[in-house]
């Protein structure tokens, strides 16, 4: 019948009822043989004696030399098949064999699942020699027991390189429940159903799973483990766990936020870091992304100018880098600037506005009324020309640029030359005679150099040729240049 | 061997409070549940409802949503019953008795001596 | 709530003889898993109650084999083969299938 021997009074046996070769304990020692603690090697020799071949599980002994009399059969005695005993606890079992001592080198192994148990186990090997046989106590002890130590044990004789296997003896250790699945976080849609689980094992088996809520309980009677735990929707916040049980007591799984995916919170800290004349550079802190990755965002631009017709400019941009850079502005210009990022939910308002201006632009038209002429007596070259009409936003005119490229045979060198704001004329040093010296002008301001007027061509003769008419370029503009010579 | 002690018998008067105690030893504390069971002189059992000893988390019977609390010491293994507001009809025997659900359903396996509350004025 | 109801209310018995307690429940204890969570408990004079049978006919530890428990769906027994002196007390039944766990109102085993 089974034996129990608990720690303490258990609301239901695991069998109902008696099962042979069982153990149910939580201080096992099957044996009251004298033992050395310690770390023992597992393998221990039997004095020397003849040997004898044997088949299966049992070595059957041949004839003797002297033919008088059959040997019995080898076996390991029977012995407790099934130990249950709590985690923590301590265990001793034992294989037990007795050998004629006409056997020499036996050894005695332990084997767990198949593989054998080497090194620092807790194997105790103890010979009782009498006139014929040796009693072979083989004991193994394993404090503090684990549910990595549950399994089925055997012990392995080898006589003369023949093996006789033990009954196995198998070993349930029983603990409290052990979560293999616990509910995870979550970002859900509110009012939308989803599922979380549970699951627990033993031994002892069966585990039952509870859900809470906020610290309410889901279900006052429980479910089976695996529990699948179907939440219809929620439209706030909630921690969930479980709890596991079974006869050894109960668990309690970690608790998980199950969040309400929302709209974004604005984002924040938009920063300016470069304006030019028609682009500004801005970044932005996101915002709470509202438990749904941004999507991405929307830069809005709006011009601040009593005469603007106040619309808005809207630039799509992806949620990552928390940058972007707005073109197609106007020089000179002042703009108020938000920043809103979207999830799968919605948009987010929009951040606090800011306040950026672009710089003065470079002018937009070149000057007008280019005329060059040849001064021969002075060797120089005039060239006038007329203010160009330039836009407020490409900001104050401080000065131009003179193109002049100088082309002969094999050779054509251009100079720039740089003149103030109040100038509308300028005279260059002929570079070289015998070419032809083409001239173009640009207006430059703060926010750089305009485009360049057309080029008028003027052609200098070698010395002692007298030529004194322009070239010009027609006021209106942009005409084909004209060279009078 | 485990064992549930509670604290002694109160004298109170209506419109009070009480706070019962169920100090557990030989187990471990916080791997249980603990069930409260009242007894009205001369009558039968009612199932208060429990509290998981790890994680607080109580569930009270209907009756005894209110002025019932379920707490713990998990330092000390005790488990507490605070009642307020006390009327007379809560003089009775209040037991703890260590509760979790096995592979035979809930389990009330071990029981506190009782603790006797009397509401008097 | 699952109403628990016992008879008889009083039970005098001569030591030695047999005794049988009923307890009907109005709903079935049977669970969805094929379980009946019916219960009996033992409360001696004086003393704290004690478990005695659970999912109606197992002993619990330490009860002696003259206890014995049947029944299914809402009609359940608890029988003592032969009456002994320890045995005086109040017997309940209690159910565990449905929330919240209810129980019978007491037969009390007195000897006569």
């Known amino acids: 019948a089974i034996t129990e021997a608990r720690e303490e009074a258990k609301p239901y046996p695991l069998f109902p009822g008696p099962l042979p070769g069982s153990l149910q304990t939580d201080h096992t020692s099957l044996l009251s043989l004298p033992h050395t603690s310690g770390y023992q090697p597992a393998l221990m020799f039997s004095p020397t004696q003849p040997g004898r071949p044997y088949t299966g599980n049992v070595a059957i002994p041949r004839v003797t030399s002297a033919g008088s009399k059959l040997l019995p059969p080898l076996a390991f005695k029977h012995t407790v098949g099934h130990i249950i005993l709590s985690e923590h606890k301590d265990v001793k079992f034992n294989c037990s064999i007795s050998v004629p001592n006409i056997y020499q080198d036996t050894t005695i192994s332990w084997w767990k699942d198949g593989k054998e148990l080497l090194g620092a186990h807790h194997a105790i090997t103890q010979f009782y020699p009498d006139d014929e046989v040796t009693a072979i106590i083989a004991s193994f002890s394993i404090t503090s027991v684990q549910r990595s130590d549950n399994g089925s044990y055997i012990c392995k004789m080898k006589i003369n390189n023949e093996e006789i296997v033990s009954d196995p003896i198998y070993i349930e250790v029983q603990g409290l429940p052990h979560f293999t699945k616990q509910p995870e976080s979550m970002n859900v849609t509110r009012n939308t159903a989803f599922n979380l689980t549970c699951q627990a094992v033993g031994p002892p088996e069966p585990v039952n799973i509870f859900w809470v809520q906020n610290s309410s309980r889901v279900n006052e009677q429980p479910e089976k483990s695996p529990s699948v735990l179907t939440v219809p929707g929620l439209t706030e916040m909630a921690v969930f766990s479980c709890e596991a049980h079974n006869d050894k007591g109960l668990t309690v799984s970690k608790g998980v936020q199950i969040n309400i995916k929302a709209i974004p919170s604005p984002p924040t800290e938009v920063s300016i870091h470069n304006s030019t004349a028609h682009s500004i550079l801005i970044s932005w802190v996101p915002g709470f992304d509202g438990y749904s990755p941004f999507r991405n965002c929307s830069v809005q631009v709006k011009e601040v100018d009593p005469l603007s017709n106040g619309s808005v400019m809207i630039f799509n941009t992806s949620a990552s880098p928390h940058m972007y850079q707005i073109k197609q502005l106007q020089a000179l210009a002042n703009y108020s600037i938000g920043v809103s990022c979207m999830n799968e939910i919605g948009w987010s308002a929009v951040s606090p506005w800011i306040l950026a201006s672009t710089t003065e632009g470079a002018p937009s038209v070149a000057p007008l009324n280019v005329t060059v002429f040849l001064n021969e007596s002075r060797d120089n070259v005039d060239i006038r020309w007329m203010k160009p009409l330039t836009k407020r936003q490409a900001g104050e005119l401080v000065g131009y640029r003179i193109s002049h490229v100088w082309q002969s045979a094999g050779i054509s060198k251009e100079l720039l030359e740089e003149v103030g704001q109040n100038n509308s004329r300028a005279q260059i040093s002929v570079q070289v005679h015998n070419a032809t010296c083409t001239v173009r002008i640009a207006a430059v301001t703060k926010g750089g150099v305009g485009p360049f007027s057309d080029p008028v061509k003027i052609f200098i003769p070698a010395h002692g040729w007298v030529d004194h008419a322009p070239s010009s370029t027609p006021a209106p503009g942009n005409a084909d240049p004209v060279l009078i010579i | 061997q485990v064992q549930l002690v509670q604290s002694g018998s109160e004298l109170k008067k209506p419109g009070a409070s009480v706070k019962v105690s169920c100090k557990a030893s030989?187990?471990?504390?916080?791997?249980?549940?603990m069930s409260w069971v009242r007894q009205a002189p001369g009558q039968g059992l009612e199932w208060m409802g429990w509290?998981?000893?790890?994680?607080?988390?109580?569930t009270y019977a209907d009756d005894f949503k209110g002025r019932f609390v379920f707490s713990l010491d998990t330092s000390v293994s005790t488990a507490y019953l605070q009642i307020s507001s006390l009327k007379a009809e809560d003089t009775a025997v209040y037991y703890c008795?260590?509760?979790?659900?096995?592979?035979?359903?809930?389990?009330?396996?071990?029981w506190g001596q009782g603790t006797t509350v009397t509401v008097s004025s | 709530d699952v109403v628990m109801t016992q008879s008889p209310l009083s039970l005098p018995v001569t030591l030695g003889q047999p005794a049988s307690i009923s307890c009907k429940s109005s709903?079935?204890?049977?669970?969805?898993?094929?379980?009946?969570?019916l219960n009996w408990l033992q409360q001696r004079p004086g003393q704290s109650p004690r478990r005695l049978m659970y999912?109606?006919?197992k002993l619990d530890s330490g009860v002696p084999d003259r206890f014995s428990g049947s029944g299914s769906g809402t009609d359940f027994t608890l029988k003592i083969s032969r009456v002994e002196a320890e045995d005086v007390g109040v017997y309940y039944c209690?159910?565990?299938?449905?929330?919240?766990?209810?129980f019978g109102g007491g037969t009390k085993v007195e000897i006569k």
């Open positions: 030989g187990n471990t504390f916080t791997t249980y549940g």
């Open positions: 709903q079935s204890l049977l669970d969805s898993e094929g379980k009946t969570y």
């Open positions: 999912l109606v006919s």
């Open positions: 509290i998981n000893n790890y994680s607080g988390v109580s």
């Open positions: 008795a260590r509760d979790y659900y096995g592979s035979g359903g809930w389990v009330f396996d071990y």
């Open positions: 209690w159910q565990g299938t449905h929330f919240p766990r209810t």
